[in-house]
Amino acid sequence: IWELKKDVYVVELDWYPDAPGEMVVLTCDTPEEDGITWTLDQSSEVLGSGKTLTIQVKEFGDAGQYTCHKGGEVLSHSLLLLHKKEDGIWSTDILKDQKEPKNKTFLRCEAKNYSGRFTCWWLTTISTDLTFSVKSSRGSSDPQGVTCGAATLSAERVRGDNKEYEYSVECQEDSACPAAEESLPIEVMVDAVHKLKYENYTSSFFIRDIIKPDPPKNLQLKPLKNSRQVEVSWEYPDTWSTPHSYFSLTFCVQVQGKSKREKKDRVFTDKTSATVICRKNASISVRAQDRYYSSSWSEWASVPCS
């Protein structure tokens, strides 16, 4: 058993049918010695008397808020949550496995640049009685500070008979050095509590591996005289690291017909313009990627040929 925060305790339960459970001793936070009784949640049933209460925690029915009283007065509370292990594996029931980029991916994180700011998100199908707490650091043995805000509900989606809730959090490395080579990974730890269930989730990454630039901005077409060709131009996204001479992007330009089945023409360039043939009813799209490190491509920025 360990303390999550003041008066909130997590009981680690290795559960299997007929498991003996965990013996927990609760102590009433009072100088009083006599006439103390204990109850659980809203029940008036007296579970025991005395300054300490010993309970056997076998299941969620044994968790909850234990209160010690004397003469009708509340002396102190202890909220017991369960962190359940089955077959040697801690439960991961609160968050959905996003399965991208691999199985057992519960937290996903992205950064728009090298400033040390990043966003993580996760999915759940639970709509109520749910709280998250996020901590982060660079490295774990001698951790350097990363400050995270509060997790917020960022999206709701209905997919068939599933309703999904997306939560996200923004974090900022306290002393980020954008140009430095990373040697220690960022660690992100999420505590999730649903009712009386506690779970924790972690992710470890280098900023360079989670970079995903914003799409190029100000995408424009300029027709070339007496030609089906157009000059496409664009700019670096505002959110990308500067100077651009050091933090350089490469670009992919794509001409896509109205039908998804039509052949796509693609051009790769390090410049912020390209000349392509604009077919009728086609659209031109441009996306960006770090020029020197193969992290994610941005989403596409698009304009119609017409």
């Epitope: 049918p17 029915g61 199908t125 639970i126 209905v158 008979d161 309703k163 009712k195 269930k197």
Partner: nanobody, 123 residues
Framework: EVQLVESGGGVVQAGESLRLSCAAS????????MGWFRQAPGTEREFAAA????????YYADSVKGRFTISRDNAKNTVYLQMSSLKPEDTAVYYC????????????????WGQGTQVTVSS
């Protein structure tokens, strides 16, 4: 958000078997842990059995252990309670429940309840 409909109750002789079904509908029903409770006249609702959302783990009250089997078919969104070697003291209204805390034998750890199906075991 989740609807539960029990079926399969009836009148049987002691020693016989019965299978109860609980059809679940609504959002995210596959993510719920499911339980069966029962209530005899003049008594509190009592836990019988529970199964986790994956269907990989089950939990039983001592009074039904070895006689009752809980199972689920997530393709059909249905939970079953196979009851064998029934005794007169198994007579009760049987309720299906859905929640997110497994294992729990406490009724208020379940969020959704069916209307119940009557099981009568005569001697």
């Amino acid at each position: 958000e989740v609807q539960l409909v029990e079926s399969g109750g009836g009148v049987v002789q002691a020693g016989e078997s019965l299978r109860l079904s609980c059809a679940a509908s609504g959002y995210n029903v596959k993510d719920y842990e499911m339980g069966w409770f029962r209530q005899a006249p003049g008594t509190e609702r009592e836990f019988a059995a529970a199964i986790n959302w994956r269907g990989s783990s089950t939990y039983y009250a001592d009074s039904v252990k070895g006689r009752f089997t809980i199972s689920r078919d997530n393709a059909k969104n249905t939970v079953y309670l196979q009851m064998s070697s029934l005794k007169p003291e198994d007579t009760a209204v049987y309720y299906c429940a859905a929640g997110r805390l497994y294992p729990s034998s406490r009724s208020r750890d379940y969020d959704y309840w069916g209307q119940g199906t009557q099981v009568t075991v005569s001697s």
